[in-house]
């Protein structure tokens, strides 16, 4: 029962997480105009992965897509790629996990197959979550770098008269949605991996039975040579699980700096 609950909860948490990753990827507010300590403007700028928008105080909002592909900064392309990979892996993971759910019966699918599928989806969710967290973190790092660069050069002009006030950008709502969603997907993936251990079918263990013969006693173990591997947990399934556990630490993100704004 606990295994089913863990698996079901893992699925639901991952589902929410992936929905959040999709939402964050589509959102326009990855970076928003910094309003703190700035002159009050009648125009508010914000940018996403796919387009930049301007909202005027009149209420009119205009968005322009980044119609160029080659002209975009490499870091922005990298963030896009990480988010898309995260969504694709998450979507596949969700599809696999639906069939892996213990509460759903599909034909004569064995528990071992369900365990394998649960583990596979768990790993996919973990990688998906890490991709989202990495993507959002790279973008955030980019913003921080640009923020301090533009703060250093905030006022540019000649003869002491201010000519241009540079627009500074800070973290947008999409970053927080992305971090939370990535974290949820990651947690969901870990829960699926934990559930996999409980789902793994273990071979029946038989205790030794003593038969007392006249003259001398001999202990017989039923199952022939198989008895030698019959004690403890099934090593084949254990190996699969351990392999999955190692996969958790395989994906790493290396944030780098790029002026995208």
């Amino acid at each position: 029962m606990a295994v089913t609950a863990c698996q079901g909860l893992g699925f639901v948490v991952s589902l929410i997480g992936i929905a959040g990753i999709i939402a964050a990827t589509c959102m326009d507010q990855w970076s928003t105009q910094d309003l703190y300590n700035n002159p009050v403007t009648a125009v508010f700028n914000y940018q996403g992965l796919w387009r930049s928008c301007v909202r005027e105080s009149s209420g009119f909002t205009e968005c322009r897509g980044y119609f160029t592909l080659l002209g975009l900064p490499a870091m922005l392309q990298a963030v896009r790629a990480l988010m898309i990979v995260g969504i694709v892996l998450g979507a596949i993971g969700l599809l696999v996990s639906i069939f892996a759910l213990k509460c759903i019966r599909i034909g004569s699918m064995e528990d071992s197959a369900k365990a394998n599928m649960t583990l596979t989806s768990g790993i996919m969710f973990i990688v998906s979550g890490l991709c989202a967290i990495a993507g959002v973190s790279v973008f955030a790092n980019m913003l921080v770098t640009n923020f301090w660069m533009s703060t250093a050069n905030m006022y540019t002009g000649m003869g002491g008269m201010v000519q241009t006030v540079q627009t500074r950008y800070t973290f947008g709502a999409a970053l927080f949605v992305g971090w939370v969603a990535g974290g949820l997907t990651l947690i969901g993936g870990v829960m699926m991996c934990i559930a996999c251990r409980g789902l793994a079918p273990e071979e029946t263990n038989y205790k030794a039975v003593s038969y007392h013969a006249s003259g001398h006693s001999v202990a017989y173990k039923p199952g022939g040579f198989k008895a030698s591997t019959g004690f403890g947990s099934n090593t084949k399934n254990k190996k699969i699980y351990d392999g999955g556990a190692r996969t958790e630490d395989e994906v790493q993100s290396y944030p780098s700096k790029h002026d995208y704004v």
Partner: antibody, heavy 118, light 113 residues
Framework: EVQLVESGGGLVKPGGSLRLSCAAS????????MSWVRQAPGKGLEWVST????????YYADSVKGRFTISRDNAKNSLYLQMNSLRAEDTAVYYC???????????WGQGTLVTVSS | DIVMTQSPDSLAVSLGERATINCKSS????????????LTWYQQKPGQPPKLLIY???TRESGVPDRFSGSGSGTDFTLTISSLQAEDFAVYYC?????????FGGGTKVEIK
């Protein structure tokens, strides 16, 4: 047809109060930011205040900050300007205007005259 | 506050001639987000409310004759009336629509020569 009609102007003593109203029609009032602009006799235009469409943000000229309050009633399609602690220099024709593209004031009322004199 | 300086204060022009009015802001009105200049031009005739002519420094309001054109970027802007008509004699104002307070220029009176 877009129409903006101001009312509530008149003669008031210094230190007194007055409430201007602007009745709007012919456009989606609740989705539009609205402004008040004044013009002293024989002088140029002076922006007074702006209120955003959602009533979330209000902006004021330094000369009226703390004395004037802009508000709106979307249900009645009305814009208001509550003027307190009036001074002689507040004497002007007060125009109500709608903000359009580029934050430009694309539609204006005919104005209402406010005279502050003892 | 942003200071809007209009020049000249008044301008005497003959019918059919070109009129040029300048407007200078103390800070750039160019928004980096959409590369648009938030400068607006208005026309005001005696006893009437102002009328919007041009917004985003160069976009004509619908119904405004094409003899009116706006140009400039950053801090320096120009309103040009290519061939003055009798109905164009009025006072013209520029306005900063980028920073609050939304300041107006002092106005330029275009008179018949």
């Amino acid at each position: 047809e877009v129409q903006l009609v101001e009312s509530g102007g008149g003669l008031v003593k210094p230190g007194g109060s007055l409430r201007l109203s602007c009745a709007a029609s012919g456009f989606s009032f609740s989705n539009s930011a609205m402004s008040w602009v004044r013009q002293a006799p024989g002088k140029g235009l002076e922006w007074v205040s702006t209120i955003s469409s959602g009533d979330s943000y209000t902006y004021y000229a330094d000369s009226v900050k703390g004395r004037f309050t802009i508000s709106r009633d979307n249900a009645k399609n009305s814009l208001y300007l509550q003027m307190n602690s009036l001074r002689a220099e507040d004497t002007a024709v007060y125009y109500c205007a709608r903000q359009g593209y580029g934050n430009a004031l694309d539609y204006w009322g005919q104005g209402t005259l406010v005279t502050v004199s003892s | 506050d942003i200071v809007m300086t209009q020049s000249p204060d008044s301008l005497a022009v003959s019918l059919g001639e070109r009129a040029t009015i300048n407007c200078k802001s103390s800070q750039s009105l160019l928004n980096s987000g959409n590369q648009k200049n938030y400068l607006t031009w208005y026309q005001q005739k005696p006893g009437q409310p102002p009328k919007l002519l041009i917004y985003w420094s160069s976009t004509r309001e619908s119904g405004v004759p094409d003899r009116f054109s706006g140009s400039g970027s950053g801090t320096d802007f120009t309103l040009t009336i290519s061939s003055l008509q009798a109905e164009d004699f009025a006072v013209y104002y520029c306005q900063n629509d980028y920073y609050y307070p939304l300041t107006f220029g002092g106005g330029t009176k275009v008179e018949i020569k």
